[in-house]
């Protein structure tokens, strides 16, 4: 009995034409939604003039269907038992699952002003930037529609910059008609314990963003894991969204549509400072904003974002140190709503339900050369938005899963 099931599982989770895993891997049968909450700034003038705390009010959800496109350029390499692919990006707005439209307006940090002042610290260049910011009538904050903020707009300030810079700005620009990868993953033919584990990303085994082991590409992409998952395991996975590998640990048994699954969560330890968790020392890349690497709960991914001062955190600065959120009013971190989890069917290693939550923030610093940043008296890590990307196995698929996998075992 058990040996036969193990044999069947080992055969069916291999990533090659004809297996159950491959069919679902090429194009996920699960509907995946990405919900956005935008942090609408309530007091832009007070912040700019008096360096007040930023008062934010989250507005959302604004929901998009994502990851509905099949993997592209799928190429098996029998020599090293890998399969490579591109994951195309696409997002379709779902009005019925949203509180408003893509034309809704938000007061947010001026992304270009914050980024340019960080990318060009040279004081004389900042004097020039100041001229262009003023000439374009830009300010520290701006009003943008949801569509502009997420998917891109032509920035009036950057349009004046005499250097060859991209004038398009957006939190996820460019997104539609782009692809993530190339990923090269083990197909499991030679060793099922390696199935779906990433061998290389963009042709490399490391990222070139971090020092030491922090730079490694570990584990899978979290859509699945090698079969026969144990509760004691630490599940490693790589997320290109956060430009790093991370891990999840077992939290509880969950019954998902009649299927027993293991809930794995990202522990607070993964977001700790090197003081609390020495393993994280190589994720601390600068000493000033991080207060000599004592701050926690935010990750500086500027190296991965062409030098733009992007910081990733959990929503509402969950698991972050008090100094990070002390400049922001209106945040209410809540573990249930704001943590990330994966519900994994342990026999196959398939992720049958997940909620990936993350917040995108931008650093803005005082600059005595740039008038709109001149009156700031401190650094701000400004929350722009947070997202909740979720997927749950459909009822039909769950039924099939129960009959073909869990039913046979029970």
């Amino acid at each position: 009995g058990d040996m036969l099931i193990q044999k069947t599982i080992k055969k069916e989770v291999v990533l090659e034409e004809g297996t159950i895993a491959f069919k679902n891997w090429v194009k996920t049968g699960t509907e995946i939604y990405r919900q956005f909450w935008i942090f609408d700034v309530q007091n832009p003038q007070e912040v700019m003039m008096n360096s007040s705390n930023i008062q934010v009010k989250q507005r959302g959800p604004y929901t998009y269907r994502v990851r509905f496109l099949a993997k592209e350029n799928i190429t098996q390499d029998p020599k090293d038992n890998t399969v490579s692919f591109l994951q195309p990006n696409g997002a379709i707005f779902e009005p019925s699952l949203s509180v408003g439209t893509e034309a809704d307006n938000f007061t947010v940090l001026n992304l270009a002003v914050a980024a340019a002042s960080h990318i060009y610290p040279n004081p004389f260049v900042q004097v020039v930037l100041n001229s262009l910011i003023n000439k374009s009538k830009s300010s520290m904050f701006q009003v943008r529609t949801l569509r502009e903020l997420l998917w891109g707009y032509t920035d009036p300030f950057l349009s004046l910059v005499p250097y060859p810079v991209s004038t398009r700005v957006g939190m996820f620009y460019p997104y539609n008609n782009t692809a993530d990868g190339v990923y090269k993953v083990f197909n499991g033919k030679d060793s099922i314990s390696k199935v779906a584990i990433i061998d290389t990303y963009k042709g490399k085994r490391n990222l070139s963003y971090w020092e030491s082991y922090c730079d490694m590409i570990n584990g899978t992409d979290a859509a699945s894991f090698p079969p026969f998952v144990e509760k004691s395991q630490v599940l490693q996975f790589f997320s290109s969204d956060i430009c790093r590998s991370i891990y999840a640990v077992f939290e509880s048994d969950v019954n998902l549509k009649g299927i027993p699954v293991y809930r794995f969560v990202l522990p607070s330890k993964a977001f700790a400072s090197p003081v609390q968790n020495p393993d994280n020392h190589c994720f601390c890349t600068e000493k000033i904003i991080s207060k000599n690497c004592t701050s926690y709960g935010v990750l500086d991914i500027s190296k991965c974002k062409e030098g733009k001062p992007v910081y990733i955190s959990l929503p509402h600065f969950l698991y972050a140190s008090p100094d990070v959120s002390e400049t922001i009013d209106g945040l209410n971190p809540n573990e249930e709503e704001h943590r990330t989890y994966l519900d994994i069917e342990p026999i196959t290693g398939f992720t049958l339900q997940f909620a990936k939550r993350l917040q995108v923030n931008l650093l803005v610093k005082p600059s005595n050369k740039i008038q709109v940043l001149k009156r700031l008296k401190r650094n701000y890590i400004v929350p722009i938005l947070w997202l909740n990307e979720t997927g749950t196995i459909g009822d039909e698929k769950a039924k099939m899963f129960r009959s073909q996998v869990t039913g046979k075992i029970n």
Partner: antibody, heavy 116, light 107 residues
Framework: QVQLQQPGAELVKPGASVKLSCKAS????????MHWVKQRPGQGLEWIGE????????NYNQKFKGKATLTVDKSSSTAYMQLSSLTSEDSAVYYC?????????WGQGTTLTVSS | DIVLTQSQKFMSTSVGDRVSVTCKAS??????VAWYQQKPGQSPKALIY???YRYSGVPDRFTGSGSGTDFTLTISNVQSEDLAEYFC?????????FGAGTKLELK
């Protein structure tokens, strides 16, 4: 069209002070930092300092601290540079230049002659 | 302060020639260098910023190059109106400093 009006010449006695003016037009005066540069006859250019007309915040070349004082009058869109305790070493052409894409617009300069 | 050395005070050229004016910085200034042209009795005119970018309206016979400590302004096909003094300037750090100038004159 950016225009910078500077008096053509000033003649002053050693030990005295002088206030050179630079009247700007053709752009929003408070939006652009104003720089001042000195050029002695047959010699190179020396940067004196800069001022932000929006709040009168000024930065100086250490060499000119105590010698030059930069101010602005927003109402008349005019930048000023006061030079004190004048000596023959201060005889030079003084240029004002607002920073747009760089030092890309210079006034015609004021020739200061310090002589008894 | 960063010192900019323009080793040649004068350079002789003929109309149609190609001429290179050099500027050496006492320390690394990246590409934070500008070039200016000054004719007698006139104020300086900006030609190049960021070592190699031409200001709008500047003829394309003017080319800037270099990074770190060594910079060059090249004028290809010299015209009579190009006979002037040329200054380099660094804006990598304050105080801003200028080279002593190179005067271009007819042979």
């Amino acid at each position: 069209q950016v225009q910078l009006q500077q008096p053509g010449a000033e003649l002053v006695k050693p030990g005295a002070s002088v206030k050179l003016s630079c009247k700007a037009s053709g752009y929003t005066f408070t939006s652009y930092w104003m720089h001042w540069v000195k050029q002695r006859p047959g010699q190179g250019l020396e940067w004196i300092g800069e001022i932000d007309p929006s709040d009168s915040h000024a930065n100086y070349n250490q060499k000119f601290k105590g010698k030059a004082t930069l101010t602005v009058d927003k109402s008349s869109s005019t930048a000023y540079m006061q030079l004190s305790s004048l000596t023959s070493e201060d005889s030079a052409v003084y240029y004002c230049a607002p920073i747009h894409y760089g030092l890309d617009n210079w006034g015609q300069g004021t020739t200061l002659t310090v002589s008894s | 302060d960063i010192v900019l050395t323009q080793s040649q005070k004068f350079m002789s050229t003929s109309v149609g020639d190609r001429v290179s004016v050099t500027c050496k910085a006492s320390q690394n200034v990246g590409t934070n260098v500008a070039w200016y042209q000054q004719k007698p009795g006139q104020s300086p005119k900006a030609l190049i910023y960021s070592a190699s970018y031409r200001y709008s309206g500047v003829p394309d016979r003017f080319t800037g190059s270099g990074s770190g400590t060594d910079f060059t302004l090249t004028i290809s096909n010299v015209q009579s109106e190009d006979l002037a003094e040329y200054f380099c300037q660094q804006y990598n750090s304050y105080p801003l400093t200028f080279g002593a100038g190179t005067k271009l004159e007819l042979k």
